[in-house]
């Protein structure tokens, strides 16, 4: 039981994780490094001409559960992988485009490394 006056709200996690960012660098990033309370990610997408586009950055803790889970999008391909184990861990993530199947791709698992 909490003592009277003791806060039940969790204390905010400090921004402890640094990630490489490319195309998704916030305004305050320096040397292509961003900081987050959540996850680092690397993402691969297919552009209109079918070429792969690889980008990376930081994800806040809030909402990262669904960001780090491959959610289908129509008529195009996209895959994302997330990690937290060390600073700049997303340098070592290498997501691959999912196979084309029935115009969109099959639900994927949550990708954490």
């Amino acid at each position: 039981k909490k003592e009277d006056g003791e806060s039940t709200a969790p204390t905010p996690r400090p921004k402890v994780l640094r990630c490489k960012c490319h195309h998704h660098c916030p305004e305050d990033s320096v040397n292509n490094i961003c900081s987050t309370d959540g996850y680092c990610f690397t993402m691969i997408e297919e552009d209109d001409s079918g070429l792969p586009v690889v980008t990376s950055g930081c994800l806040g803790l809030e909402g990262s559960d669904f960001q780090c889970r491959d959610t289908p999008i129509p008529h195009q391909r996209r895959s994302i992988e997330c990690c937290t184990e060390r600073n700049e861990c997303n340098k070592d993530l290498h997501p691959t485009l999912p196979p084309l199947k029935n115009r969109d791709f099959v639900d994927g698992p949550i990708h954490h490394r």
Epitope: H24, M43, V53, L59, Q67, P72, P74, R103, D104
Partner: antibody, heavy 124, light 107 residues
Framework: QVQLVQSGAEVKKPGASVKVSCKAS????????MHWVRQAPGQGLEWMGM????????NYNENFKSRVTMTRDTSTSTVYMELSSLRSEDTAVYYC?????????????????WGQGTLVTVSS | DIQMTQSPSSLSASVGDRVTITCRAS??????LNWYQQKPGKAPKLLIY???RLHSGVPSRFSGSGSGTDFTLTISSLQPEDFATYYC?????????FGGGTKVEIK
């Protein structure tokens, strides 16, 4: 937390233009598509188009294509929707809505976070 | 454009009731169907995306199902805060289109 704050209500004459702003905070502005959706009084929702703040790439609903322009200012994390040649049927609440998924080039269709809405009244 | 048809357009229900709303697309939209809740004077809120995935913070009494052209939103046990208007939206093909809405009122 994600916040989208829109500009205030506007009253316009038929034939005029209106420019509605949507200032984003609480996330990396350049990483998500921003959509614009409108709702006439007592009516349903109508998707107007979308803009990617990083590239400035846009997709417009053909119903508005000749009259709508969506722009962004990355220095202030703000997107804008301008509608020209206004008519009485354009009287509506205009919403910006951020997409759910991070995207760079692919188009994503999930309207996860919404602004509070801007009422535009067109009346002579 | 893909037409989205919701039924019923309105319904009356009591707290604790199981409520089902249907949405039909004029052509196959795979599973790219989202549901939104809107209360008077407020912006819509995303409830369910990609047919059945709950958005962050949405109570588990909301669920979605379907595929192709026919979709369903179910509220397993209606709560006082669930009285609102619900819209479906297809995300398969541009332009994205919404259903006409279903107003859930207190019986």
């Amino acid at each position: 937390q994600v916040q989208l704050v829109q500009s205030g209500a506007e009253v316009k004459k038929p034939g005029a233009s209106v420019k509605v702003s949507c200032k984003a905070s609480g996330y990396t502005f350049i990483s998500y598509w921003m959509h614009w959706v409108r709702q006439a009084p007592g009516q349903g929702l109508e998707w107007m188009g979308m803009i990617h703040p990083n590239s400035g790439s846009t997709n417009y609903n053909e119903n508005f294509k000749s009259r709508v322009t969506m722009t962004r200012d990355t220095s202030t994390s703000t997107v804008y929707m301008e509608l020209s040649s206004l008519r009485s049927e354009d009287t509506a609440v205009y919403y910006c809505a951020r997409d759910l998924l991070i995207a760079t080039v692919v188009v994503t269709p999930y309207f996860a976070y919404w602004g509070q809405g801007t009422l535009v009244t067109v009346s002579s | 454009d893909i037409q989205m048809t919701q039924s019923p357009s309105s319904l009356s229900a009591s707290v604790g009731d199981r409520v089902t709303i249907t949405c039909r697309a004029s052509q196959d939209i795979s599973n790219f169907l989202n549901w939104y809740q809107q209360k008077p004077g407020k912006a819509p809120k995303l409830l369910i995306y990609y047919t059945s995935r709950l958005h962050s913070g949405v109570p588990s009494r909301f669920s979605g199902s379907g595929s192709g052209t026919d979709f369903t939103l179910t509220i397993s046990s209606l709560q006082p805060e669930d009285f609102a208007t619900y819209y479906c939206q297809q995300g398969n093909t541009l332009p994205y289109t919404f259903g006409g809405g279903t107003k859930v009122e207190i019986k």
